[in-house]
Interface confidence: low
């Protein structure tokens, strides 16, 4: 049978390198041949190229060298396949060379800051050694900043007579450190270079961007006054790298702006002792080249009511993340203040806050928490310059089964009667909520029994059993990973009893 | 650093023919287009002719066309220029000059010493 | 080919002067202009590209300017190390050529 007819041949001129052409050659049971025929210097010549490898994935392409490919030129292209029994010729195929034109990337040989010039960087590069000099070169420069993966692409031409190799990046944030990669192409081609290899640059420092205020207000001590404790951090979005030097703190009662103290600290917290009134609490954080924004929060008086506006709360693991979900019925409360800790019997020392607008629900990767802990979450409704009062709950990022199970006693023995008693495991052993208990009990020789109960109950009577006979029971604490069983015990029923 | 080192000067007859040589380090040979420039006693500077070593494309003065002819042989990073049926007239002092790339393949940034070929009978 | 006409072929200065040479295409080459600078018995050196990118190390008393077909080159303050030959050369395209040169002499 005749050979199939070459179809979707395809060229691309690698600049001062060679044409390759390319093509599909069908399902061909016996050796073929293949010749592509051109016409080149606008039609004046032709010549050919034949395929001489015999393995079928190299018999689809051919190339044509240097030095007979200039540009501008208009080519056609015909793939003819030969085999014993005849020749079949594809579709004559039309190209212009700039449009098939693929050069080497650009090598970009700085990546700066401009002096001066604010959330912008330059780029300067090298054009491909090989490029049309007759032909103008457009580029994609694609950017994203170090710890994130996903790129950002702008798309801009150079006039070829443009000696000026840069481009001014701007709309960055500041002090921050960029990756930039470029590529390029002839203006007329769709053909894009390789990227080039990748450079780093940084943004120029500014003054600190703002700060996010927050505090925890203590019960008040003998002599009426409050420890008021102070956190701060940088706004979301400031850069990464952005240095502090220090922060200035002036506080005042709302009634009486003369009585302002201030400080100075480097730390990130700092614990005020306030008196019982409404005080009003403002910062700045500095660096060399200025103060950041005023970050101002009011501390309502020991005796002020706070509003209560979240009506329920639920958490619940999806995807890899912890989210929390609440119901107002404050419809124009759309700020909220999240706080979180560990629940451990000592002092939280690792308490993070986060504040949300515009919605009523917050979620936290789970690699952000630890895994098998209990988290204390609380919501903040915040209105203005009014805190409401929280919500609390627990919730656990990851739950794991219980590391022991509960610690059982037997009680009240009788004749066919048992109460089982047991203790709720710690709270560092439990790996997750309890949701449940399951009681275990069999006779010596006898079938097993299970009774489950709720995670409220902590005892539980059991019935009808045998008198005068011996039975093994064992309480399981039960997360939604799993059970964890406690250590058995025995005990016998009597063979009588005084109420009989 | 970049440097240019040219062959030692050359005494022919008129007719015969001379290659200069242009050893290039501290560099990408292969990176960069090498000129021929040459200028005569007491004259100015005459551009000859270019080649760009990556693929042997090479580009001349019309008026040498049909005399000069630039090679370059990456192996030693090394670039020739040979002139052949010299005339008195061709006695010059011939220099290889690399392009500064990012300025355009026609800025002369690094020249050889230069390699003085004297013409006479 | 573009021809490069520099004027004047010669001139006479001292320390101190400040000198100004031409240079003028005959056809459009827009800023596609280089300067260099030549002391006898040595290789010329590149001083000013792109009419008026000082090259690597050149003194910021050398500076260019134009663009189009006229174009000069400036010594603020002439230094006695600037007496030399000044040639321009097009960079626009294949072939090149250069100016005739002027000859910066001791006044």
């Known amino acids: 049978a005749l050979p199939a007819k070459p179809e979707n041949i395809s060229c691309v001129y690698y600049y001062r390198k060679n044409l390759t052409c390319t093509w599909s050659p069908g399902k061909e049971t016996s050796y073929t041949q293949y010749t592509v025929k051109r016409t080149y210097a606008f039609g004046e010549k032709h010549d050919n190229c034949t395929t001489n490898s015999s393995t079928s994935e190299n018999r689809a392409s051919c190339s044509f060298f240097l030095p007979r490919i200039t540009i501008p030129d208009n080519y056609t292209i015909e793939v003819e396949a030969e085999n014993g029994d005849g020749v079949i010729k594809s579709h004559m195929t039309y190209w212009r060379l700039e449009n098939i034109a693929k050069t080497e990337p650009p090598k970009i040989f700085r990546v700066k800051p401009v002096l001066g010039i604010k959330r912008m960087i330059q780029i300067e590069w090298i054009k491909p050694e090989l490029a049309p000099v007759s032909s103008d070169l457009k580029y994609t420069l694609r950017f994203r900043t170090v710890n994130s993966t996903s790129w950002m692409e702008v798309n801009f031409a150079k006039n070829r007579k443009d000696k000026n190799q840069t481009y001014n990046l701007t709309g960055l944030q500041p002090f921050t450190e960029y990756v930039i990669a470029l590529r390029c192409a002839v203006k007329e081609s769709k053909f894009w270079s390789d990227w080039s290899q990748e450079k780093m640059g940084m943004t120029e420092e500014e003054a600190p961007c703002g700060l996010e205020l927050w505090r925890v207000l203590k019960p008040a001590e003998a002599d009426g006054r409050r420890p008021v404790r102070l956190l701060w951090k940088k706004a979301r979005g400031a850069p990464v790298l952005e240095k502090t030097l220090g922060y200035n703190i002036w506080y005042y009662p709302e009634s009486n702006t003369n009585l302002t103290e201030t400080m100075n600290t480097t730390n990130q917290q700092l614990e005020l002792h306030l008196g019982g009134e409404s005080f009003w609490v403002s910062m700045i954080s500095y660096n060399s080249l200025g103060k950041s924004p005023v970050a101002t929060l009011r501390i309502p008086a020991i005796q002020e009511k706070s509003f209560q506006c979240i009506e329920v709360m639920q958490a619940c693991v999806a995807e890899d993340q912890l989210v929390v979900k609440w119901q107002s019925s404050a419809l124009d409360v759309n700020t909220w203040m999240i706080e979180w800790f560990p629940d451990v019997d000592s002092e939280p020392t690792t308490l993070s806050w986060e504040s949300v607008s515009q919605a009523t629900n917050w979620t936290i990767q789970q690699d952000k928490l630890k895994p098998f802990w209990c988290y204390n979450i609380s919501v903040y409704p915040m209105l203005h310059d009014k805190v409401g009062e929280p919500y609390s709950i627990q919730a656990y990022a990851k739950e794991g089964v219980p590391s022991e199970g509960p610690e059982t006693k037997v009680e009240n023995i009788g004749v066919k009667t048992v109460t089982i008693t047991w203790k709720e495991i710690p709270k560092s052993e439990r790996k997750g909520i309890i949701c449940n208990y399951t009681i275990f009990y069999q006779a010596e020789g006898g079938k097993g029994f299970s009774k489950t109960v709720n995670s409220s109950i902590l005892q539980y009577g059991l019935e009808s059993l045998k008198r005068k006979t011996s039975y093994i029971v064992q309480v399981m604490a039960s997360t939604s990973a799993g059970g964890t069983n406690g250590t058995s015990i025995n005990f016998k029923t009597l063979s009588f009893s005084v109420f009989e | 650093q970049v440097q240019l080192v040219q062959s030692g000067a050359e005494v022919k007859k008129p007719g015969a023919s001379v290659k200069v040589s242009c050893k290039a380090s501290?560099?990408?040979?292969?990176?960069?287009?090498m000129n021929w420039v040459r200028q005569a006693p007491g004259q100015g500077l005459e551009w000859m002719g270019l080649?760009?070593?990556?693929?042997?494309?090479?580009s001349y003065n019309q008026q040498f066309q049909d005399r000069v002819t630039i090679t370059a042989d990456e192996s030693t990073s090394t670039a020739y220029m040979e002139l052949s049926s010299l005339r008195s007239e061709d006695t010059a002092v011939y220099y290889c000059?690399?392009?500064?790339?990012?300025?355009?393949?026609?800025?002369?940034?690094?020249w050889g010493q230069g390699t003085l070929v004297t013409v006479s009978s | 080919d573009i021809q490069m006409t520099q004027s004047p072929s010669s001139l006479s200065a001292s320390v101190g002067d400040r000198v100004t040479i031409t240079c003028q295409a005959s056809?459009?080459?827009?800023?596609?202009l280089a300067w260099y600078q030549q002391k006898p018995g040595k290789a010329p050196k590149l001083l000013i590209y792109n009419a008026q990118t000082e090259a690597q190390g050149v003194p910021s008393r050398f500076s260019g300017s134009g663009s189009g077909t006229d174009f000069t080159l400036t010594i603020s303050s002439l230094q006695p190390e600037d007496f030399a030959t000044y040639y321009c050369q097009h960079h626009y395209d294949s072939p090149l050529t250069f100016g005739g040169g002027t000859k910066v002499e001791i006044k």
């Open positions: 501290g560099y990408t040979f292969t990176g960069y287009i």
């Open positions: 080649i760009n070593p990556y693929n042997g494309g090479t």
């Open positions: 000059a690399r392009d500064g790339y990012d300025d355009g393949p026609y800025t002369l940034e690094t």
């Open positions: 056809e459009d080459i827009y800023s596609f």
